[in-house]
Interface confidence: medium
């Protein structure tokens, strides 16, 4: 932002009324009036170019310093070319000197040269040659100097003529302020520019109404330079929740709009399934029956729990059941649907029922399922099972009602056979098993599966109608994994545990019952 100038003295604007002191009195500097652009203008002029040594002083009135620390002095003046006078005026000069003196009081007409300190010699960029003078072309020069730091109540300026033909048309003394500024939604007060050129005054800004420093952000600061320019902005303010930036201010969100945090973003329209918000809303309330999960952004539509899984089937396969379902017809407006499967078993004889989570095995954890199928195994025969599949989403926890579908299945399968090792040699294993007598009539055959431990690529199967089998052609001193499963008309029965049996080593041959 451009510096603001506070004028302390303006000769040109005073219309010749300032009455500056000349020394020596009545000689040298003289107040003159002229006409320029059909307007009367005043100037202090001196032109004693033919008179040898000159020491003519013009002193301003006492200027009250006020809050100024560094003053700027702008001079507009014209200087005649010494060669425009007959004989070149050997004592003629083309410069004059600028002085200042600080004081706490006005000395009036008591003028003392010794109190003045020289600021600079003022030389023109352009001198007025004869042809310009005759044609009344005033070659106006503009020079600026600055002085600081000032410490006393006021000051004088003085102009020393040493034999030039010069006219002072304007003397303007001012100091600079960094103007009041709104930047980054922060207000910076009008600040007096410092007096030392390299230094920058740090100024703290204040957030405008309804603006805040964002969490973790820097407080707004600017630097006021000597020339009254604001530099190096640091930090910023953001419109708080419920307000948005409109030009240099924060304006409340219109009804039907909201803003949930301090940010640079504008207010957003209330999302679907929300009630119309009042002015300055930070969020939009959900319609009845709709909810917002704690992690849901305020910009997301309100949602509700899903309906039940649309279609559920339970397909029994021996001691296993495959449960399949389709997603709910109404997702509640969310994509974070998960499913939970629970199991209940009932004994047909007694009609007693209870949870069966501990005794069955699921193909994947039954809670938080994202797929729409699961296999349940290790089911007990002659048992009725009821499976419940519940659909949940991010807002299900906010309501007490549940969305689920159930399917029942009866298990008419055998129990797993109980297996024993009857005998072994270096190349064979004799295995027997048993199942409860009531189930034996339903068994068609038994299937014995065996393989070397550690060899997952190949296995052998033997089927038999009896309750024992000898597995031949085995490798000596080798552990085999053996499982027995009953086969019924309905399919596979429950498999036995997998047993580890080892053949004998060649040096310890002979049958050994275990």
């Amino acid at each position: 932002a451009q510096g603001k100038e506070v004028v302390l003295l303006d000769f040109a604007a005073a219309g010749g009324e300032l009455g500056w002191l000349t020394h020596p009195y009545g000689k040298g500097w003289d107040l003159m009036q002229n006409i320029m652009n059909d307007m009367p203008i005043y100037m202090y002029s001196v032109c004693n170019v033919m008179s040898g040594d000159q020491d003519n002083w013009l002193r301003t009135n006492w200027v009250y310093r006020g809050e100024a620390e560094r003053i700027f002095i702008e001079l507009k003046f014209t200087v005649r070319d010494c060669n425009s006078f007959p004989g070149g005026a050997s004592s003629c000069k083309e410069t004059f000197n600028l002085y200042y003196a600080e004081s706490d009081l006005d000395y009036g007409t008591n003028f003392q040269k010794r109190l003045f300190t020289k600021i600079d010699t003022i030389a023109p960029d352009e001198i007025t040659v004869s042809s310009d003078f005759e044609a009344r072309h005033v070659k106006l020069n503009v020079e600026e100097r600055s002085v600081g730091p000032l410490t006393r109540k006021g000051f004088y300026l003085a102009f020393q003529d040493i034999g030039a033909c010069v006219a002072l048309l304007s003397v303007r003394v001012y100091y600079k302020k960094c103007p009041e500024l709104l930047q980054g939604l922060a207000h910076f007060p009008e600040t007096i520019a410092g007096s030392d050129a390299p230094s920058l005054a740090t100024v703290a800004g204040t957030c405008v109404d309804h603006a805040v420093v964002p969490p973790g952000g820097e407080e707004p600061r600017m630097h006021c330079a000597v020339d009254g320019e604001w530099l190096v902005p640091i930090g910023q303010c953001l419109c708080q929740a419920g307000y948005e930036k409109v030009e240099d201010a924060c304006q409340a969100c219109s009804p039907g709009f909201f803003k949930f945090e301090a940010s640079e973003s504008p207010c957003l329209e209330c999302p679907e399934h929300t009630l119309p918000s009042p002015e300055g809303a930070t969020s939009c309330e959900c319609e009845e029956g709709f909810f917002r999960a704690p992690q849901d952004p305020a910009s997301m539509p309100c949602t509700r729990p899903p309906s039940a899984p649309h279609y559920l089937t339970a397909v029994g396969m021996g001691a296993k059941v495959e449960l399949r379902w389709t997603p709910p017809q109404d997702s509640g407006g969310r994509e974070d649907i998960v499913y939970s499967v629970t199991c209940e078993q009932c004994w047909p004889e007694s009609g007693e029922c209870g949870p069966c989570e501990a005794s069955v095995r699921y193909s994947e954890p039954p809670h938080g399922l994202t797929r729409t199928s699961v296999t349940v195994s290790d089911l007990e025969p002659h048992m009725n099972y009821t499976f419940t599949v519940e659909a949940r989403n991010g807002v299900s926890g906010l309501v007490t009602s549940r969305s689920f579908r159930t399917a029942s299945v009866s298990i008419n399968q055998t129990e797993p056979p109980k297996v024993r090792l009857e005998g072994r040699s270096t190349t064979s294993l004799s295995v027997s098993w048993s199942i409860p007598p009531p189930q034996q009539s339903r068994v068609w055959k038994y299937e014995v599966t065996y393989r070397k431990k550690g060899d997952s690529n190949s296995y052998n199967v033997r089927r038999t109608e009896g309750f024992s089998v000898t597995l031949d052609d085995l490798a000596p001193d080798t552990t085999y994994l053996v499982q027995v499963q009953a086969l019924t008309q309905e399919g596979q029965g429950a498999g036995s545990k997998v047993h580890e049996f080892q053949t004998l080593s060649p040096e310890g041959s002979g049958n050994l019952a275990v």
Epitope: P40, S84, V166, L169
Partner: antibody
Amino acid sequence: EVQLLESGGGLVQPGGSLRLSCAASGFTFSHYMMAWVRQAPGKGLEWVSRIGPSGGPTHYADSVKGRFTISRDNSKNTLYLQMNSLRAEDTAVYYCAGYDSGYDYVAVAGPAEYFQHWGQGTLVTVSS
Amino acid sequence: DIQMTQSPSTLSASVGDRVTITCRASQSISTWLAWYQQKPGKAPKLLIYKASNLHTGVPSRFSGSGSGTEFSLTISGLQPDDFATYYCQQYNSYSRTFGQGTKVEIK
């Protein structure tokens, strides 16, 4: 020494024309603003017209505007005043006058000029 | 146009007298004023310019003062050669008007 010598005056009938000349010597003519000033018999001085050092600008008194024309020839060091539509009230001694800013010890020229050097004058009589 | 009024119209004085002629402008002319001396049958001669500056070769008994609208020409010790008519002239505007003149005659 600066010398200005007017010529061309005489008796002329009302409505007639006359051309005055002013021969300059003893100074650099092309540096000077030149003017004509007249003085009716027994009366005071009246400024008539002026011309800048290089031929412009030119100014005229309201009483002669549109009838008189001032000009100069710097190569001949001569100033002219062409007077047309002459009237009885134009009867006067016409002086040629000059101003050189080099002799004017002021920083800014006055809005107009004064006259440092004068000729001896030439009489113009307008009468029937 | 700016009107220039001189007073008195005629002034009778003796050699050695101090005489003052005044000139009033109808509006402010700052210090843009010149004084001339004219003797019968002769061309005017410049005495003073810019109200108080003495023209080259003019005796120091002549002095001028004033600014704005009131001006004066003073001859501090009248000499026989000084009996003449004196004119003021403003050059604050292009009209460059003269006063009507003041005749200084021998008493």
